[in-house]
């Protein structure tokens, strides 16, 4: 990864970035004054417009999500946008601010009872009522009552990484999402070539930890594209 650094004399606490653009490699998107952002009613002038290009939610802050800035816009154009508050429209959990989740297209409070019910409801809606198992695990085994903590421990059900304790991230496991350890040096990681490709994984891995990046293992450079092994390596 590109190592970026915090400057000790840096200007801090300026207005949060309202966006940025992500697209296909080499693509460019204009950052013009007076762009209207979804979820807000104001026009933001270029004076404090700080576009933050993103490929996925994890690159944005806990109070943000990664999405196209315009309704019906180019699907490849993505920026960090402010999360949606309660009763605002949503399409997925990450769009809702911490303490909320997306239910029937609306951000609602994720108090424990509703949260648990919604996870089961989502599983049922997405995969039908078939309660069959995979590798001996029930689709609902990760939903035990012990899994609701203020900051999720390893194995706890989560909606986003901010729900998990330090050193853990929120990643898909079967048909749920649980807190898993952030990857350490030498561990196998997943390099996503396309936005959204991680959505196909039943067992999603966390990202590499601080100071590490997901790169092709040196002795695998000659291997075919499909068999290249990526591991977390020092910059």
């Amino acid at each position: 990864t590109l190592n970026s650094v915090l400057n000790s004399n840096a200007i801090k606490n300026l207005p949060p970035p309202l966006g940025g653009a992500a697209g296909h490699p080499g693509s460019a998107v204009s950052a013009a004054p007076g762009i209207l952002y979804p979820g807000g009613n104001k026009y933001q002038t270029i004076d404090n417009y700080q576009p933050y290009p993103c490929a996925e939610d994890e690159e944005c802050g806990t109070d943000e999500y990664c999405a196209s800035p315009t309704r019906g816009g180019d699907a490849g154009v993505q920026i960090c946008l402010a999360c949606r508050k309660r009763r605002k429209r949503c399409m997925r959990h990450a769009m809702c601010c911490p303490g909320n989740y997306c239910k029937n297209g609306i951000c609602v409070s994720s108090d424990q009872n509703h949260f648990r019910g919604e996870i089961e409801e989502t599983i049922t809606e997405s995969f039908g009522n078939d309660h069959s198992t995979l590798d001996g695990y029930s689709r609902r085994t990760t939903l035990s009552s012990k899994m609701y903590h203020t900051k999720g421990q390893e194995g706890s059900v989560c909606l986003r990484s901010s729900d998990c304790a330090s050193g853990l991230c929120c990643a898909r496991h079967f048909w749920s999402k649980i807190c898993k350890p952030v990857l350490k040096e030498g561990q196998v990681c997943t390099k996503h070539r396309r936005k959204g490709s991680h959505g196909l994984e039943i067992f999603q891995r966390c990202y590499c930890g601080e100071g590490l990046s997901c790169r092709i293992q040196k002795d695998h450079h000659q291997a075919s594209n499909s068999s290249r092994l990526h591991t977390c390596q020092r910059h």
Epitope: V5, P17, A55, E58, E59, T62, C80, S213
Partner: nanobody
Framework: EVQLVESGGGLVQPGGSLRLSCAAS????????MGWFRQAPGKEREFVAA????????VYADSVKGRFTISADNSKNTAYLQMNSLKPEDTAVYYC?????????????????WGQGTLVTVSS
């Protein structure tokens, strides 16, 4: 101490070119986003360009689109801003900006942190 150090600024004639570099040094953390901002005398700091290296994703201010190109060299921990067809109104202090890594590092918002800047003067 941690730093973003810009270089490459200077005096150039209208229509000329310059290439700015931003080297990251000191205690580092992983960020996929780098950017450039500028501040002309008596004006607000404004966004110029940003890049998300993971997909070669770029965004530009309208005022520089088609003239400036942002890029990054992962292996050298360096970001670049190639500036062509420079105009007198491009005269400013140019600041390199580093993304804070977002939620992976516990931040509520993805923000930029700035270097000290390098002066670019476009004048005949």
């Amino acid at each position: 101490e941690v730093q973003l150090v810009e270089s490459g600024g200077g005096l150039v004639q209208p229509g000329g070119s310059l290439r700015l570099s931003c080297a990251a040094s000191g205690r580092t953390f992983s960020s996929k986003t780098m950017g450039w901002f500028r501040q002309a005398p008596g004006k607000e700091r404004e966004f110029v360009a940003a890049i998300n290296w993971s997909g070669g994703l770029t965004v530009y201010a309208d005022s520089v689109k088609g003239r400036f190109t942002i890029s990054a060299d992962n292996s050298k921990n360096t970001a670049y801003l190639q500036m062509n067809s420079l105009k007198p109104e491009d005269t400013a202090v140019y600041y390199c900006a580093a993304g804070n890594g977002g939620r992976a590092y516990g931040y509520s918002r993805a923000r930029y942190e700035w270097g000290q800047g390098t002066l670019v003067t476009v004048s005949s």
